[in-house]
């Protein structure tokens, strides 16, 4: 359940993340798996641990294998697997299937390609990216943060693309390169103005004090792929990020595609901890696209704790 | 109403096996850890086993290999498999559900069966 | 394994009067997420135990106000303000730092 495979290029940064995911306070320890042994933590060394993450800087055929990393979470020391594999440069232009991440589709209003795993690493922009090992050039190609957008998508577009970046570590550099397959699919989709499934308008959510809630924006703008949708939750008129409680998160849910074909969005906020004052917030679910901007509001209210297992009935 | 309901308790020589399992209701069962803890008659309790989200298992020393703990995330069942068992075994079994092995989250081992019965004894 | 200690092994409480149980552990509960994990439960006559504080402070849903935990590292205490005749029953501390370890029990009476 908890073991995931991982790959890289010998000579560039890999950096792998524990499957077996912690809170941020706690402790993980890296081991090799076939030895036992302790992976350090100083980053002086070529291949280091730092908390959930393993580090290769840079990766060799040698590191390839099974690593073991110990999340020391309260009540158990829980383990995931990673399973390392460090390839050697290719010489010819050809990506072999083995070194591919998940393949994208794209159409006519949506042709994002993201650049797969960027998130571990310390990059700035642009990304450069290539298809087919040809450096993309044009004013149809626009790198943007972590994902390429393709103007005007055509059959001819599909293809296998490769991001490039740096990732720096403490003032040094290191090359990262990911390919993935995009894919182009004829769709006749539409895009309306944005319908919220859940919650429902002026919706009253009730909440444990002291216990975590958590409350779901569901929304959906049209039918096939959706150019620009939204959905995010703020607190009295203002976002998350900028309130400022950091018990209170927001999360991406699934993307959804109902069998009608309806594109929806889910937004979770997690409140952590429910105190007194956040009865007294305005919570906004905000489902936005081009054709513009719908909300519903929620406020909480205290449940009574009738709880059937209280020992004071 | 959030329950766990235990059976499979009984009389068994020692040296033998018994199964116990756990029906769990009103919660989403597969996201938590969940424990087995005994209680021998007039004494303490002692934890005996425990699961986590992953199938990953955990036991003291003094049943490890004796006995397995396992779960079926789409029956909303947890089983205690014990072999070679012991007159020291004899005790009541409970099945118990901890935190939310998900999430992280932790508010005690806050459900409880009502415990099954397990005597070892020629 | 962390072992715990309970004091004392038996209570006699006159209901109206406060109560103080306590229970040592062989090492800090302290996690690196800031939490004791220090749980106390109360067992009544005949039934299963029961959940009163979890985390070392925080009282279970349901439980009354008039029981509360404190303490920090190695030293826990269990706080009844106004004993009331059906709090009587063993209770128990217990570790959730590295597995679980129940302490012996306390066994609370009305004298």
């Known amino acids: 359940k908890f073991s995931k495979q991982s790959w890289g290029l010998e000579n560039e940064a890999l950096i792998v993340r524990c499957p077996r995911q912690g809170k941020p306070s706690y402790t993980v320890d890296w081991y090799y798996s076939q030895t036992n042994k302790s992976i350090p933590t100083q980053e002086r060394n070529r291949v280091f641990a730092s908390g959930q993450l393993l580090k290769f800087l840079p990766a060799e055929v040698a590191d390839s294998g099974i690593y073991t990393c110990i999340v020391r979470s309260p009540t158990f020391n829980r383990t995931g697997y990673a399973n390392v594999t460090i390839y050697k440069k290719q010489s010819d232009c050809n990506v072999p299937d083995y070194l591919m991440y998940s393949t994208v589709s794209g159409s006519e209003k949506n042709s994002k390609i993201y650049c797969p795993t960027i998130d571990l690493y310390n990059w700035t922009a642009p990304l450069e990216w290539f298809k087919n090992c040809q450096a993309l050039q044009g004013s149809r190609y626009r790198a943007h943060k972590s994902f390429l957008v393709i103007d005007n998508v055509m059959t001819e577009d599909a293809g296998d693309y490769t991001c490039k970046f740096i990732h720096n570590e403490n003032g040094a550099n290191y090359s990262v390169t990911a390919t993935r397959s995009f894919t182009v699919k004829d769709e006749q989709g539409f895009s309306l103005f944005p319908v919220i499934g859940a919650p429902a308008q002026n919706e009253i959510k009730e909440v444990e004090i002291g216990k975590n809630a958590n409350l779901t924006c569901s929304a959906c703008f049209g039918k096939g792929t959706q150019f620009l949708a939204a959905v995010l939750w703020q607190l009295n008129g203002t976002k998350i990020t900028d309130f400022g409680e950091p018990r209170i998160q927001q999360e991406e849910g699934q993307n959804q595609s109902f069998s009608n074909g309806l594109a929806c969005l889910d937004m979770v906020l997690r409140i952590a901890d429910v105190k007194e004052e956040d009865l007294l917030l305005q919570y906004d679910c905000l489902a936005l696209n081009l054709h513009g901007l719908r909300r519903h509001t929620v406020r909480l209210s205290r449940k009574n704790p009738i709880d059937h297992h209280s020992i004071y009935c | 109403e959030v329950q766990l309901v235990e059976s499979g308790g009984g009389l068994v020589q020692p040296g033998g096996s018994l199964r116990l399992s756990c029906a769990a209701s009103?919660?989403?069962?597969?996201?938590?850890?969940m424990h087995w803890v005994r209680q021998t008659t007039g004494k303490g309790l002692e934890w005996v086993s425990a699961i986590d989200l992953a199938g990953d298992t955990y036991y003291p020393g003094s049943v490890k290999g004796r006995f397995t703990i396992s779960r079926e995330d789409a029956k909303n069942s947890l089983y205690l498999q014990m072999n070679s068992l012991r007159a020291g075994d004899t005790a009541v079994y409970y099945c118990?559900?901890?935190?939310?092995?998900?999430?992280?989250?932790?508010?005690?081992?806050?459900?409880w069966g009502q415990g099954t019965t397990v005597t070892v004894s020629s | 394994d962390i072992v715990m200690t309970q004091s004392p092994l038996s209570l006699p409480v006159t209901p109206g009067e406060p109560a103080s149980i306590s229970c040592r552990s062989s090492q800090s509960l302290l996690h690196s997420d800031g939490y004791h994990y220090l749980d106390w439960y109360l067992q009544k006559p005949g039934q299963s135990p029961q959940l009163l504080i979890y985390l070392g402070s925080n009282r279970a849903s349901g439980v009354p106000d008039r029981f509360s935990g404190s303490g920090s590292g190695t030293d826990f205490t269990l706080n009844i303000s106004r004993v009331e005749a059906e709090d009587v029953g063993v209770y128990y501390c217990?570790?959730?730092?590295?597995?679980?370890?129940f302490g012996g029990g306390t066994k609370v009476e009305i004298k």
């Open positions: 217990m570790q959730a730092l590295q597995t679980l370890t």
């Open positions: 118990a559900r901890g935190g939310d092995g998900y999430n992280y989250d932790y508010y005690g081992i806050d459900v």
């Open positions: 009103g919660f989403t069962f597969s996201t938590y850890d």
